[in-house]
């Protein structure tokens, strides 16, 4: 049994950097916790942009410092990435992971395309 | 090293070049002229671990990821532990995309 | 895996096939390369998918429960012990191995 990950195909981040998407998991089993991480690609680079761990029923917590939230409703969380900027458009990948109880599953979105438009500066007033 | 069957013998790998506790991490072995087989994962944080059937209640696997270490502790070796042990780590996308170059366990009276 | 040897010369096509006893999904199928004396080396995830560094020789493909490594052309170090894996559930299994030796 394989566990598929559905996510958005593109999306485009606020004027204020924010971006949000769904990642929606079909659950091969009654997982009681489940790990959500965000990765990055940019050509053949695979960088971590968050994770959180979360107790099936709970919200998931990303760390302090962490650029994204997220909440998580059933087999759907809800993520917002913020702080963006037009250099941080790319390819955001979705992963899941039963963590517990066995059998682990490992699940992959295909990627959500975000598209990052840096805000023109207001002109200067006289 | 040589260790004689019924005792006991502690793997350690030391990892560099990467966000240790962003990975999970493996041991897998490979008994003499064999094939690979996964032994023991250990997530993340270290709360939580798998293990194969063959080595269930014997093998323990921890990290400690303030100095990016695994640890396999193995207890109750049999002849048929004997094996090149190596840890891997579990790339962003789920294959093992890093080994260590191997330690050989032989368990041997 | 088979089969288990592959007698091939350098600059042949060496194709090698792993065969799943079950089901599975193509983005958790891995091939690794093992020299004599090595560590294994990831070649190809996601069962097409090329590992960083690993030369546009090799290339993999299938679905479901057929998957297929191909060496389009052989050279001196590509003679080595090739295993698939599947990495998409717990246990992560292996599969037994082809032997691919100069002919």
């Known amino acids: 049994k394989a566990m598929h990950v559905a996510q958005p195909a593109v999306v485009l981040a606020s004027s204020r950097g924010i971006a949000s998407f769904v990642c929606e998991y079909a659950s091969p089993g009654k997982a009681t916790e489940v790990r959500v991480t965000v990765l990055r690609q940019a050509d053949s680079q695979v960088t971590e942009v968050c994770a959180a761990t979360y107790m099936m029923g709970n919200e998931l917590t990303f760390l302090d410092d962490s650029i994204c939230t997220g909440t998580s409703s059933g087999n759907q969380v809800n993520l917002t990435i913020q702080g963006l900027r037009a250099m941080d458009t790319g390819l955001y990948i979705c992963k899941v992971e039963l963590m517990y109880p066995p059998p682990y599953y490992l699940g992959i979105g295909n990627g959500t395309q975000i598209y990052v438009i840096d805000p023109e500066p207001c002109p200067d007033s006289d | 090293g040589v260790v004689q069957p019924g005792r006991s013998l502690r793997l350690s790998c030391v990892a560099s070049?990467?966000?240790?506790?962003?990975?999970?991490m493996h041991w897998v072995r490979q008994a003499p002229g064999k094939g690979l087989e996964w032994v023991a994962v250990?997530?993340?944080?270290?709360?939580?671990?798998y293990y194969a059937d063959s080595v269930k209640g014997r093998f323990t696997i921890s990290r400690d990821n303030s100095k990016n270490t695994l640890f396999l502790q193995m207890n109750s070796l049999r002849a048929e532990d004997t094996a090149v042990y190596y840890c891997a780590r579990g790339g962003h996308f789920g294959p093992f995309d890093y080994w260590g170059q191997g330690t050989l366990v032989t368990v041997s009276s | 895996q088979s089969p288990g040897t592959l007698s091939l010369s350098p600059g042949e096509r060496a194709t090698l096939s792993c065969r799943a006893s079950q089901s599975i999904s193509s983005s958790f199928l891995a091939w690794y390369q093992q020299r004599p004396g090595q560590a294994p080396r990831l070649l190809i995830y996601?069962?097409?998918s090329r590992a960083t560094g690993i030369p546009d020789r090799f290339s993999g493909s299938g679905s479901g429960t057929d998957f297929t490594l191909t060496i389009s052309r052989l050279e001196p170090e590509d003679f080595a012990v090739y295993y698939c894996q599947q990495y998409g559930t717990s246990p992560w299994t292996f599969g037994q191995g082809t032997k691919v030796e100069i002919k």
């Open positions: 996601g069962a097409s």
């Open positions: 070049g990467f966000t240790f506790s962003s990975h999970g």
């Open positions: 250990i997530w993340y944080d270290g709360r939580n671990k």
